[in-house]
């Protein structure tokens, strides 16, 4: 189910690269944050807390990955036209509960700007 | 068809103690969260406690946490509530009922008991 | 914690009006918001789900709107099954329900 685009700049470019913008409600303890290029999962990454809230970061699929207090940003680097497509964040809710997850994405247009290496 | 049915509910003095049960049938226990729901006479409904499937993560309304620990087991398809140091504010009829889901995850209470009275007096 | 405001508390309505019941939250829940039935000596039946789905076996003379803070219950068409008291319940952070809107006979 998607639940929507995202209403916010879901894409950042900076020196031939994209930072991927995946936001959370501030509210959310614990939660799996994946990017999904299309239907294929391309990074994740799983906070929760321990006993004494000390809190895990986990990836199963690494990419550089920054976390913040309501958003994860996801960074793809040597742009090429290939990496055009539709990106969402897929957000799996685990605490505060019930269990909920929520879809938001956007199409990643590529301009020759934006790419890499261009030839001048 | 899919049930909940609850018992163990009685009369008990305010600091006692009561376990409620929750047998399920129909469904496959093991694969649902569940909770127990509460409404007190003539009022409306206060969640009470939640347990995942694996029984690994617990949570509890403010109004009952230390006193309250919900259980479950999935080999004997049943939800367990063991109420301690009872309050006249906790007469109520307990509801065990199943959190639902689906591809977004919760939908809210899809099955629910009969309901067991609990009621704490002196 | 979130509240759940619901209005009216009490409703009078006759068989074949059309009824809204409106919930209001105390901050964003999104659209994690559930509608229930509950009949005296009843235990609640669930009839929506994520603010707009309906619950399969539900009818369909109930649909349910909005999303952030406002939502509604609407009957369509309201038939003698359909007096009871109705319950909206937020899901988005734990769980808290309204305090319920009785459908009574005018």
């Known amino acids: 189910e998607i639940n929507g685009s995202a209403n916010y700049e879901m894409f950042i470019f900076h020196n031939g690269g994209v930072q991927i913008l995946c936001k959370y409600p501030d509210i959310v303890q614990q939660f799996k944050m994946q990017l999904l290029k299309g239907g294929q999962i391309l990074c994740d990454l799983t906070k929760t807390k321990g006993s004494g809230n000390t809190v895990s970061i986990k990836s199963l699929k690494f990419c550089h990955s920054q976390l913040s207090n309501n958003s994860v940003s996801f960074f793809l680097y040597n742009l090429d036209h290939s990496h055009a497509n539709y990106y969402f964040c897929n957000l799996s809710i685990f605490d505060p509960p019930p269990f909920k997850v929520t879809l938001t994405g956007g199409y990643l247009h590529i301009y020759e700007s934006q790419l890499c290496c261009q030839l001048k | 068809q899919v049930q909940l049915v609850e018992s163990g509910g009685d009369l008990v003095k305010p600091g006692g103690s009561l376990r409620l049960s929750c047998t399920a049938s129909g469904f496959t226990f093991s694969d649902y969260y569940m909770d127990w729901i509460r409404q007190a006479p003539g009022k409306g409904l206060e969640w009470v406690s939640y347990?995942?499937?694996?029984?690994?993560?617990?949570y509890y309304a403010d109004s009952v946490k230390g006193r309250f620990t919900i259980s479950r087991d999935n080999a004997k398809n049943s939800l367990f509530l063991q109420m301690d140091s009872l309050r006249a504010e906790d007469t109520a009829v307990y509801y065990c009922?199943?959190?639902?889901?689906?591809?977004?995850?919760?939908?809210?209470?899809?099955?629910w008991g009969q309901g067991t009275t609990v009621t704490v007096s002196s | 914690d979130i509240q759940m405001t619901q209005s009216p508390s009490t409703l009078s309505a006759s068989v074949g009006d059309r009824v809204t019941i409106t919930c209001r939250a105390s901050q964003s829940i999104s659209s994690w918001l559930a509608w229930y039935q509950q009949k005296p000596g009843k235990a609640p039946k669930l009839l929506i789900y994520k603010a707009s789905s309906l619950e399969s076996g539900a009818p369909s003379r109930f649909s349910g709107s909005g999303s952030g803070t406002q939502f509604t219950l609407t009957i369509s068409s309201l038939q003698p099954d359909d007096f009871a008291t109705y319950y909206c319940q937020q899901y988005y952070s734990y769980w808290t329900f309204g305090q319920g809107t009785k459908v009574e006979i005018k």
């Open positions: 347990i995942s499937s694996s029984g690994d993560t617990i």
């Open positions: 009922a199943r959190d639902a889901h689906y591809v977004s995850g919760s939908k809210g209470v899809d099955v």
